[in-house]
């Protein structure tokens, strides 16, 4: 009951995460407009993976794509590779695990075949959160680098009259998604992991060894594990997990048309 | 089209307060801001505030936030301001704006003039 | 405050001629974000309102006739009346859209021989 228990929840957690990882993915606020110094600004910037944005007081939006591959910088390719590879393993490891919970029967798979699936998940779900985390902390240390240098340029060059301010980027909505729904998946693979490990031993078919002793007649049944093929049928009782009345409310709280102090 | 009719001109007391409207129509109010612009002839044009009738947000120009309230009714569709401490400085025209793309204005009130009295 | 210098403060042209006004801003208005710079060039006739003619610097506003235009980036612009006409006459004003307080120029006064 514990290890269905384990696995359905894994599962749930995993579904969430991978969720948030591809709502991140597709989300626009991956960095915005530094406005500590200004903090009601008249047009605000910000930028996602996939296209930059600007946004006027006036509530007028207009996103631009990247429509180049090219000119684009490599620490941003590395990061859409590594979301797109958590998705993309994150997605296969939803599909494997399907088939691998315990509270669906498909004709007669085994139970090692059930436990062997469980762990395949377990591990495509660990790397995709880490392929999620490790996109978003990448794309986080390039903002980190970039606010100060633009924060150093910001004050050379201002001894002239005309004063150009440079806009400053900081994080995003969408990272702190990444990071949670990363995070999510990780613990949602490792908790598919270690549901494994409750089914792989017991779960295991041994056929039974006889043993006949003189005198006796004694069916000898080694311990700890259970027989059951060519012993008639598994009489283990299998608990339903009804894992799909669960509705998750929605986290991510995206910016109104107007935001104002 | 947006329009925005406002009110009729007043001659007010100095140091006494006045409110004027611009009520908007032709298009949703609560989705636009409304922008208060003061124009006199020493000082040319001089951006006020804006409310944004939606939410009653509001933002103002420093210079002008101990002088002008902006205020909004959603069921008239109308935006207000209110000039409080008048001086012979607050005589002037005033206009409300709906705003647009790039920030700019595109649609405007005929104005209204207020002429502080001693 | 971003401060708006216009120049000339007035100017008196003959009808059909080409006319240019400059709107000097003391900060950039140009947002790296989209590449467009937040300034608004208005007409404002004896006793009506101001009327937008141009807006992002260049962009006309659909109705203003094709006489005028605008151009410049930064913190220097132009607005350009091609050939003017005698309804033409007015003062006109560029505004800064990319920083509150949104501010004006002092206008140019634009009058017909």
């Known amino acids: 009951m514990a290890v269905t228990a384990c696995q359905g929840l894994g599962f749930v957690v995993s579904l969430i995460g991978i969720a948030g990882i591809i709502a991140a993915t597709c989300m626009d606020q991956w960095s915005t407009q530094d406005l500590y110094n200004n903090p009601v600004t008249a047009v605000f910037n910000y930028q996602g993976l996939w296209r930059s944005c600007v946004r006027e007081s006036s509530g007028f939006t207009e996103c631009r794509g990247y429509f180049t591959l090219l000119g684009l910088p490599a620490m941003l390719q590395a990061v859409r590779a590594l979301m797109i590879v958590g998705i993309v393993l994150g997605a296969i490891g939803l599909l494997v695990s399907i088939f691998a919970l315990k509270c669906i029967r498909i004709g007669s798979m085994e139970d090692s075949a059930k436990a062997n699936m469980t762990l395949t998940s377990g591990i495509m779900f660990i790397v995709s959160g880490l392929c999620a985390i490790a996109g978003v902390s990448v794309f986080a240390n390039m903002l980190v680098t970039n606010f100060w240098m633009s924060t150093a340029n910001m004050y050379t060059g201002m001894g002239g009259m005309v004063q150009t301010v440079q806009t400053r980027y900081t994080f995003g909505a969408a990272l702190f998604v990444g990071w949670v729904a990363g995070g999510l998946t990780l613990i949602g693979g490792v908790m598919m992991c270690i549901a494994c490990r409750g089914l792989a031993p017991e779960e295991t078919n041994y056929k039974a060894v006889s043993y006949h002793a003189s005198g006796h007649s004694v069916a000898y049944k080694p311990g700890g594990f259970k027989a059951s093929t060519g012993f008639g049928s598994n009489t283990k009782n299998k608990k339903i997990y009804d894992g799909g009345a669960r509705t998750e409310d929605e986290v991510q709280s995206y910016p109104s048309k107007h935001d104002y102090v | 089209q947006a329009y925005l009719q406002q009110s009729g001109a007043e001659l007010v007391r100095s140091g006494a307060s006045v409110k004027m409207s611009c009520k908007a129509s032709?298009?949703?109010?609560?989705?636009?801001?409304i922008h208060w612009i003061k124009q006199t002839p020493g000082k040319g044009l001089e951006w006020i505030g804006y409310?944004?009738?939606?939410?009653?947000?509001?933002n103002y120009n420093q210079k002008f936030k101990a002088k002008a309230t902006l205020t909004a009714d959603t069921s008239s569709s109308t935006a207000y301001m209110q000039i409080s401490s008048l001086t012979s400085e607050d005589s002037a025209v005033y206009f409300c704006?709906?705003?647009?793309?790039?920030?700019?204005?595109?649609?405007w009130g005929q104005g209204t003039l207020v002429t502080v009295s001693a | 405050d971003i401060m708006m210098t216009q120049s000339p403060s007035s100017l008196t042209e003959t009808a059909g001629e080409k006319v240019s006004m400059s709107c000097k801003s003391s900060?950039?208005?140009?947002?790296?974000?989209?590449?467009?710079?937040?300034l608004t060039w208005y007409q404002q006739k004896p006793g009506q309102p101001p009327k937008l003619l141009i807006y992002?610097?260049?962009t006309r506003e659909s109705g203003v006739p094709d006489r005028f235009s605008g151009s410049g980036s930064g913190t220097d612009f132009t607005l350009t009346i091609s050939s003017v006409q005698a309804e033409d006459l007015a003062v006109y004003y560029c505004?800064?859209?990319?920083?509150?307080?949104?501010?004006f120029g002092a206008g140019t006064k634009l009058e017909l021989k």
């Open positions: 704006a709906r705003d647009y793309y790039g920030n700019s204005f595109a649609y």
């Open positions: 032709g298009y949703t109010f609560t989705s636009h801001n």
């Open positions: 409310i944004y009738p939606g939410n009653g947000g509001t």
């Open positions: 900060q950039s208005l140009l947002n790296s974000g989209n590449q467009k710079n937040y």
């Open positions: 992002w610097a260049s």
């Open positions: 505004q800064n859209g990319y920083r509150f307080p949104f501010t």
